[in-house]
């Protein structure tokens, strides 16, 4: 401590205190007295900036008096005890309680010592995220929606994705006075490649220890995208059976597969088994264009494949896929 006559009593308090709407909060305020310094506190006073008069006073001989006795209470000050702790509890926090407060000690012989504290009135928001199910539009549309309800101050919403996309964020007053509901839409041109992918909504707020992450699984409805696999251009007479597969990606799932040829129905050597087509061994060369038609709730799409079965020694070639 400094030598006698150079020390000073100081008021210690945080510059800012957070409290939650409807809850109680303590505004801490203490008098720090150097070791050898004698001081006598006759009065503790709390006042709000911009308001005349005091909201709470604790007098050494008269005890406490409050502007709103049901909402205010000195936490530690007691009659007959040394007044070193002016901490004040506020009950039933309201939006209008937010502001600057002065905690003041009247000390003898040092005089008045005060400090200002900013009370922040917070409301913890509730967060939800949901998919916006879309069809192929060719235009940017909202594909995910993230809502932070009843926050004070408004929550900050950001989106994280490898897919690009643009946020569109808006605010409206919350249910409770002074609170805000923030809605953020994630906007992208829908494509089949995006279906089933994830985007993350990140919500940040003063009341959270860490940001809240909400994952949205994207849904894009699109008609089937069809291709046929299983043919390698090396099919020869006399070889075993082979299988062609009709590969279809769609949302919702395909409801039906229909195999045909450009000439009409399937020839005898081709047997349809749902998404697969069984090609039986043939004894003469063929050159046929096969068609797979896939249907889902949004429509039908087809793929064509020209298959040739040629003459030649099968042992020298990879040939048809064997079962």
């Amino acid at each position: 401590w400094p030598p006698p006559g150079t020390g000073d009593v100081v008021v210690q308090a945080p510059t800012q205190v957070p409290g939650f709407l409807g809850d109680s909060v303590t505004l801490p305020c203490y008098l720090q007295v150097p070791n050898m310094e004698v001081t006598h506190v006759s009065q503790l006073t709390w006042a709000r900036h911009g308001e005349s008069g005091s909201m709470a006073v604790f007098h050494q001989t008269q005890g406490p008096s409050y502007s709103e006795s049901k909402r205010l209470e000195f936490v530690a000050a007691r009659l007959g005890a040394e007044l070193r702790n002016a901490s004040l509890r506020m009950f039933g926090l309201r939006v209008e309680d937010e502001g600057n407060y002065t905690c003041l000690f009247v000390t003898f012989p040092q005089g008045s010592r005060s400090v200002d504290i900013w009370l922040r009135v917070l409301a913890k928001p509730q967060n939800t995220a949901e998919v916006q199910k879309v069809q192929l539009t060719g235009e940017p549309v909202p594909m995910a929606r993230c809502v932070s309800t009843g926050g004070r101050p408004p929550a900050q919403i950001t989106w994280h994705s490898d897919l690009g996309g643009m946020p569109n964020t808006s605010q409206v007053p919350g249910f409770l006075s002074g609170t805000v509901t923030v809605t953020s839409l994630w906007i992208l041109v829908p494509s089949s490649q995006v279906d089933g992918k994830n985007v993350t909504c990140k919500v940040e707020h003063e009341s959270f220890e860490k940001p809240q992450l909400l994952t949205v699984n994207l849904t894009v409805y699109y008609p089937p995208e069809v291709s046929i696999s299983g043919y390698d251009n090396n099919w020869y007479l006399g070889q075993n059976e082979a299988t062609l597969t009709c590969d279809a990606r769609s949302n919702p799932e395909p409801t039906g597969y229909n195999w045909s040829t450009t000439m009409g129905p399937l020839p005898p050597f081709a047997v349809a088994q749902g998404a697969q087509l069984l090609i039986r061994p043939v004894d003469k060369p063929i050159n046929t264009t096969l068609i797979c038609n896939v249907t889902n709730a949004l429509g039908a799409r087809q793929a064509e494949l020209t298959v040739q079965v040629k003459e030649g020694p099968p042992s020298e070639h990879s040939g048809i896929s064997r079962n």
Epitope: T6, M36, Q60, S112
Partner: antibody
């Protein structure tokens, strides 16, 4: 107006005690700090102690600790200073002074007229 | 204990300005000494002028002002009046006790 009226002059023998009174009027006595100060003949002013009238809390000059006691009687708005084991060098004019508050700092506001204490065998 | 030293006497002309100072034997006077100034006119009671270094007591004319001047406490009288002729005492706080200066006899001549 604010006034401090002290008791009359005292003549005491060495080793005796003296009790000087200081009656306050014109303000809220219980919210006040009162200091006692003395001035020996041909000497400067010397601070003895202060008391907070409302609670009786005191702070003494270490030089006088054990020999001086300050008290208040809130019913009569009177402060008292008792000095024991009197010596000849305690001969002085004893003053009570009320501390006033400007809203920022304290000052020695109003003084009593003084009480002459003579210690002589 | 600390010793508080003041000019034994000063003279000022009516309407003039004079500064009374107050030195501490322990070093520089600071705001933590809460310098007080009191006035005593002949045959009258003491009267408080300044508290807490620079806070003027109610009813004290604005021509009296308190401050710190270098390493000393100071009482400045601007525009001295004949009725300001008096003894002026400085009082300093030293953590747990007050110490009075020897006083300055101010003559307005």
């Amino acid at each position: 107006q604010v006034q401090l009226v002290q008791s009359g002059a005292e003549v005491k023998k060495p080793g005796a005690s003296v009790k000087v009174s200081c009656k306050a009027s014109g303000y809220t006595f219980t919210s006040s700090y009162i200091s006692w100060v003395r001035q020996a003949p041909g000497q400067g002013l010397e601070w003895i102690a202060w008391i907070y009238a409302g609670t009786g809390d005191t702070n003494y000059n270490q030089k006088f600790t054990g020999r001086v006691t300050m008290t208040t009687d809130t019913s009569t708005s009177t402060a008292y200073m008792e000095l024991r084991s009197l010596r000849s060098d305690d001969t002085a004019v004893y003053y009570c002074a009320r501390h006033g508050y400007t809203g920022r700092g304290w000052y020695f506001a109003v003084w009593g007229q003084g009480t002459t204490v003579t210690v002589s065998s | 204990q600390a010793v508080v030293t003041q000019e034994p006497s000063l003279t000022v002309s009516p309407g003039g300005t004079v500064t009374l100072t107050c030195r501490s034997s322990t070093g520089a006077v600071t705001t933590s000494n809460y310098a007080n100034w009191v006035q005593q006119k002949p045959g009258q009671a003491f009267r408080g002028l300044i508290g807490g270094t620079n806070n003027r007591a109610p009813g004290v004319p604005a021509r009296f002002s308190g401050s710190l001047l270098g390493d000393k406490a100071a009482l400045t009288l601007s525009g001295a009046q004949p009725e300001d002729e008096a003894e002026y005492y400085c009082i300093l706080w030293y953590s747990n006790h007050f110490v009075f200066g020897g006083g300055t006899k101010l003559t307005v001549l």
